[in-house]
């Protein structure tokens, strides 16, 4: 069976995941025999999950991160907060605004010359054999003088979309985030009714490509809310 593959970018023209609601965490929400919808995947449990507004950074916008609104506040209550600008304090990369990353507790520009060379060998194996990463730990080893701008290919682990090659975005895949293809015209997309409503998806789809938007497929206007098919369509 397709099992939990349903919400993968690669699957075209299949019903989207159900709304943003998945019943009780860990329960199977299925609309067709043998198919388990993301969010109701039988392998998943969601611990400490706050349905709204967020549980993890990727549920927030590109200029936001997910955290407790008060310092030292209840870890169970998290909302999407505005990203931190350069030179502001941080604890992880997602806290920093696009174009920056967290190094030694401070948001610094990722386009500085030393960015690719100085950061420790981890994230994605996606950067080829020279494979630098986005972790804020210095390698303290000398690298050759060539620039490290290789981006993650499809299937590579990533932290944000800027880690991925052109035509790919960084999206949730079970408990990790990997580079997936940006959606093309006619491909099924996920239209979130409200911010944070995609927290239950175990797969995230990428956004629609340039010149496309995620809209209800014309012949699905009459369908019920939960089964309306959204696809990437020309503006």
């Amino acid at each position: 069976t397709l099992n939990s593959v349903l919400n993968s970018n690669a699957i075209k023209n299949l019903p989207p995941p159900l709304g943003g609601a998945a019943g009780h965490p860990g329960s199977a929400v299925s609309a067709a025999p043998g198919i388990l919808y993301p969010g109701g995947n039988k392998y998943q449990t969601i611990d400490n999950y706050q349905p709204y507004p967020c549980a993890e950074d990727e549920e927030c916008g590109t200029d936001e991160y997910c955290a407790s609104p008060t310092r030292g506040g209840d870890a169970g209550v998290q909302i999407c907060l505005a990203c931190r600008k350069r030179r502001k304090r941080c604890m992880r990369h997602a806290m920093c605004c696009p174009g920056n990353y967290c190094k030694n507790g401070i948001c610094v520009s990722s386009d500085q010359n030393h960015f690719r060379g100085e950061i420790e060998e981890t994230i994605t194996e996606s950067f080829g054999n020279d494979h630098s990463t986005l972790d804020g730990y210095s390698r303290r080893t000398t690298l050759s003088s060539k620039m490290y701008h290789t981006k993650g290919q499809e299937g590579s682990v990533c932290l944000r979309s800027s880690d991925c090659a052109s035509g790919l975005c960084c999206a949730r895949h079970f408990w990790s985030k990997i580079c997936k293809p940006v959606l093309k015209e006619g491909q099924v997309c996920t239209k979130h009714r409200r911010k944070g409503s995609h927290g239950l998806e175990i797969f995230q789809r990428c956004y629609c490509g340039e010149g496309l938007s995620c809209r209800i497929q014309k012949d699905h206007h009459q369908a019920s809310n939960s089964s309306r098919l959204h696809t990437c369509q020309r503006h």
Partner: antibody, heavy 115, light 108 residues
Framework: QVQLVESGGGLVQPGGSLRLSCAAS????????MTWVRQAPGKGLEWVSG????????YYADSVKGRFTISRDNSKNTLYLQMNSLRAEDTAVYYC????????WGQGTLVTVSS | DIVLTQSPATLSLSPGERATLSCRAS???????LAWYQQKPGQAPRLLIY???NRATGVPARFSGSGSGTDFTLTISSLEPEDFAVYYC?????????FGQGTKVEIK
Amino acid sequence: QVQLVESGGGLVQPGGSLRLSCAASGFTFNNYGMTWVRQAPGKGLEWVSGISGSGSYTYYADSVKGRFTISRDNSKNTLYLQMNSLRAEDTAVYYCARTIYMDYWGQGTLVTVSS
Amino acid sequence: DIVLTQSPATLSLSPGERATLSCRASQNLFSPYLAWYQQKPGQAPRLLIYGASNRATGVPARFSGSGSGTDFTLTISSLEPEDFAVYYCQQYMTLPLTFGQGTKVEIK
């Protein structure tokens, strides 16, 4: 460099419990999902469980669901696997590894379930 | 569940020879979400290839991965003495994550 060190394995009777730990260093722990994989003696690899970077999302293989609990303490850079109601077939070397394709592995800790 | 079948079970070759290992999925993976690992006796596995064809950090260029859909291949262009080990493929397209049963590359 990235290091993962498991501990907590040992001999336990059927029905007993064990808690495995995996101490991580050399990378920003809370940026990464983590995975437990096991290998029975002389056998192949079997995925056991996975957990997202914040710990909000956890996943289990059918063979351990309801008996094992994966968790993490990001302030301690440590991953855990609480194993309850252990069975003989849970006997294996348990590895912690980073991400969904396992780019770094610990050395493993042996869990033996036997009476 | 996606079953990964590796062939052959054992490959007997000499140093310098080319090794071709196959991994066949019971379902189309749609995306290149396949990894290859090397494991030597008494050691943890080591990632070689991810995303079907991307070499991991520090992995020599003689290792290459290819394939899509249901058929994937790991090629070792010229075997070195240290390459004799067991090789596993793993899919991360869907849950449960599954591994192949392994191919043992032994010295002829």
